[in-house]
Structures are given as C-alpha cells and as structure tokens.
Amino acid sequence: YSNFRKSVDSTGRRQYQVQNGPCSYTFLLPETDSCRSSSSPYMSNAVQRDAPLDYDDSVQRLQVLENILENNTQWLMKLENYIQDNMKKEMVEIQQNVVQNQTAVMIEIGTSLLNQTAAQTRKLTDVEAQVLNQTTRLELQLLQHSISTNKLEKQILDQTSEINKLQNKNSFLEQKVLDMEGKHSEQLQSMKEQKDELQVLVSKQSSVIDELEKKLVTATVNNSLLQKQQHDLMETVNSLLTMMSSPNSKSSVAIRKEEQTTFRDCAEIFKSGLTTSGIYTLTFPNSTEEIKAYCDMDVGGGGWTVIQHREDGSVDFQRTWKEYKEGFGSPLGEYWLGNEFVSQLTGQHRYVLKIQLKDWEGNEAHSLYDHFYLAGEESNYRIHLTGLTGTAGKISSISQPGSDFSTKDSDNDKCICKCSQMLSGGWWFDACGPSNLNGQYYPQKQNTNKFNGIKWYYWKGSGYSLKATTMMIRPADF
C-alpha cells in the first residue's frame, strides 16, 4: 500500500514522507529565496485592496512565481526518479527474501515428511508383529475349538441315545395315561349320572319340604282355629249347662255368626282368638290377593304385624324396587313384608309403628310412632310418621318430614350421591339420614365405624351396626 504525507519540521523546513508497504522515505526540500516574508503586503492571504497594483510590480511577481514553479517541477522529477530506482531495488530484495523463505519452508516440510514416513514405517512394523501374534493366537484357539467340537459331538451322540431311551419310556407312559383316561372318563360318567339322580332327588325333596311347610302353616292355623273352636264349644257347653241348671232357662240357643276366615292384619287374627305368635296368611284390603306375615302376639299386648326383621345377616337386603314392593325373605327369619301391602293397609286405617332394636352388648330399645303410613307407589312409598316416644332416642332417626323410598335401582333421595348404593339396602333415605335398618349386616366386633351398617343414630350413634331389628305395625285403636 502507498501513502503520501507533507509536513513542516521544527526548523520550519518542509518535508515529504512517502510510505510504501513496510518502508517509508522522507525527503527534505530546499527553500526558495524569492519567496516573500510573511510581513509582505502581498502575501497570498492578504486582504484584496480597493486600488489596483502597478503593472511593473505584477510582471516582476509573475517571473518570480514561474521560477519557483520550475524549481519545484525539477525537484518533483528527481523525487520520482529516486522513488522508482529505490522501489526496483526494494522489489528485488523482497523477491529474493521470499524465495529464500520458501526454500527454507520447503526444506522444513521435507524433513517433517521424512520423519513422519519413518514413524509410519515403525508403526507398520509394530502392527505386522501384532497381526502375527494375533494369527498365532487364533490358530491356537481354532485348535482348541476343534477339540471342543469333537467332545461336543460325542456328548450329542450320548444325548441322542438317551433321548431315544426316554422316548421309549414316554411312549410306555403315554399308553398308561390313555388307559387311565379311559377309566377316569367311565368314572366321571358314572358320577355325572349319580349327580343327576341326586339333583332330581333334591328337587323332589325341596318340593316335599315346600308342601310340608305349607301343611305346617295350615296345621298351625287349623290348630289355632281348632283351639278357638274348642274354646267356643266349651263356652257354649258351659252356657248350656248354666241355662239348663237355671230354673227360668229358655230352651233356645243363640246361633253363632259365621266364622271370619280372612284377615287384614295380625290384630284381626289376635282378636279372632288366635293368640300364638307365628306365620299367618293376610289378605290385601279389597282384594283376594294373599301374603304371609309373621304375627307377634306377645309383645305389648300382641296383634303386631311384623313388616321387617333382621337378626343374623342370612338374607341379602340390597334388593330391587320390585322386590321391596312385593316383599322378600322368610317370615320365620329375616324378611321385608312388602311396601305395596303396607301402603294399602296403612292407607285404610290409622296404624302405629313400633321399632325394636338390639345392640351387641345385650341392650334393647324401642321407638314408637303413634301414627304411621306409607304413600302409594306413585309417591315412591313416602313414609309419614308422627308422635315419637320410646327409649331409642328422643329425636326420630327416620328423617322428618318423611322421605321417599329408594333402592339400588330407584334413587329418590335428597343426596347428590345414591344413598342406596352407598349405604346398601332400600330405605327412606334423606341425604342420607340418621337411620338405615336395611343396611349391611355386620357380626360382633366388626360392627363399628361402618358407613353402610344397620344404623339407628339417635340410639347408638354413627357407624354402629345393630345386632337385631324388628319393625311392626298395629291399628291405633287396638
């Protein structure tokens, strides 16, 4: 690259500096004598005057300027020549230096290549040695493998002969198994036949038992009727004897009215003279449809129609709407009489409801409602209760006012949940409420902290599952 700079040194002389690449050249030029001093009135930067200069002065000044210009031109020519000469020398020197430098580099590269080649040769020699060692090793291994293969071949031959022996044994065993299978299938067939025969026998026995049960119930009723008839006969005989012995006796006997043969509830049965607790047949009001119920003729004067009973967990109370409507279980044990019958019965006359409870510690309590009735199915058998007395809590554990009945398949409660599914059993759930006598049955020592047990909060508190419960109804005017 080139650079040209003009400056003035400390003595006031002008100097020119030329820089070309890494080299710089400085030239000091001689001053011209004809130059005016700065005190001249005609200095180049003097202010122009209004009056014109003399002609002679102008001519003289032009000559002086021409001389100066010529001098400068010569100097510039010399300078140019000098620069060109010097540049040529410099270029030659630079080229020589470059060649020398390149030669040195080439020698260095050559040396380096020789060194690398020598190193590579040494490496190759080492690799060759390693390959030879490896080859030798592999040959030894091949020899060992060959020996091993021979041994394995022998072992395989031995094993093959063993397998053949085993196959022979297997065939023998298979034959034995086939023989045993044949025998077993014969035995199974015989057992199946016996099972079928037993099933037939069981079904026959079941029907016989059913018949016997019916006969037993009939016999019980008949027995009660016979007892009543006997009692009546004795009374008649006594009255006849009295009449006969009386001097003013009339020879006429009042004709008894026809015996009542159908009963609406257990109170009617009790009043008819049948005062033994047991199973009786009741007839739906204004209908010929019959239903079997347990009549408690002992508690509190008797005449109670039992509508619910729990005692041992033998009956599943997680039932459908239809089952709770029609009733389920056995009147001799755990059972639900049926919502439809109770609804019809309590809709005709005023009934009281008595609930008897037993805990696992041998305690008993009861709640008595002086008015109880169930609405019809169209109102989901809603319960209505008033007038609570008794020992099983001062507050009613059946929510007031009465709730609709709910079952696992008919959710009519006031809860965001489904109480019947959560608590188990059909009941007059609220949300879900302080009671559920149709909950899951839990045995002793497993009956606390239960979310779905047999619950009567205002007697035993939450989570306590009771041992036994009985719900019974009787006419209020009994």
Epitope: K414, C415, I416, C417, C419, M422, D430, A431, C432, G433, P434, N449, K450, F451, G453, K455, Y457, Y458, S462, G463
Partner: nanobody
Framework: DVQLVESGGGLVQPGGSLRLSCAVS????????IGWFRQAPGKEREGVSA????????YYADSVKGRFTISSDNSKNTVYLQMNSLRPEDTAVYYC??????????????????????WGQGTLVTVSS
C-alpha cells in the same frame, strides 16, 4: 377397617396454641370429608371444623372462625387442626370423624353430625391458667 386416631391434645394456658392431628387409615382422604368435633362435660357433641381434601373446601363453626385452621396432608393421610388464641371455653374432648364426601344434600355444603360414621377415640384439650 376404618380407623381414626387423634393426638396433640394437652393442657395449655389461655391465649396459647395447640395442633391436633388425626391419622386416618382404611380409607383415602380424596374420597372422604374429615370433621373435627368437640364435647365438653355435660354438653352435646358439636361440630368445630371440617375439610374436603378433594376440593380443598373447609368449614368452621362461628365460635372458632379466625382462630382455628384445618388442613390435610393426603400423602400422610392425616388431617390437622391448628388452634390459636385458645380460650377456657375451648376445653373439651376433641374427636375427628369421617364421612363419604358425596353424602351431601342438594344445595348444602356440609354434613350433619349423624352422617359421620367413622370416629376416633378423642383427645382431651384443657385450656386453663
């Protein structure tokens, strides 16, 4: 079987603090609401506070609002009742109890006492100088 075990009760001076714990087993807190109840001698059991872990909802009786704080740690299956600024009338046996979270009446936020079917044995808190 469901079990609830209370701890943390004791004797404390008026203005003092106590933290009760209720360790629950046999159920998961996500599906249940846990309530704290108390019963002073000769008085009926009353609700103090309750929590539904699933939604983080809490309930406080007016008598303890601003003083008691209920919280739960589902990983430990434990519910806590932090009781500050205790008064002599806070003296009682404190019980924790559980109820299935869904057993709620339409339109209601909390549960009557009879819906809580699982109970602990209680821990005595006595506030006296």
């Amino acid at each position: 079987d469901v079990q609830l075990v209370e701890s943390g009760g004791g004797l404390v001076q008026p203005g003092g603090s106590l933290r009760l714990s209720c360790a629950v087993s046999g159920i998961t807190l996500d599906d249940y609401a846990i309530g704290w109840f108390r019963q002073a001698p000769g008085k009926e059991r009353e609700g103090v506070s309750a929590i539904r872990s699933s939604g983080g909802s809490t309930y406080y009786a007016d008598s303890v609002k601003g003083r008691f704080t209920i919280s739960s740690d589902n990983s430990k299956n434990t519910v806590y009742l932090q009781m500050n600024s205790l008064r002599p009338e806070d003296t009682a046996v404190y019980y924790c109890a559980a109820v299935p979270a869904g057993r709620l009446r339409y339109g209601e936020q909390w549960y009557p006492i009879y819906e809580y079917d699982a109970w602990g044995q209680g821990t005595l808190v006595t506030v006296s100088s």
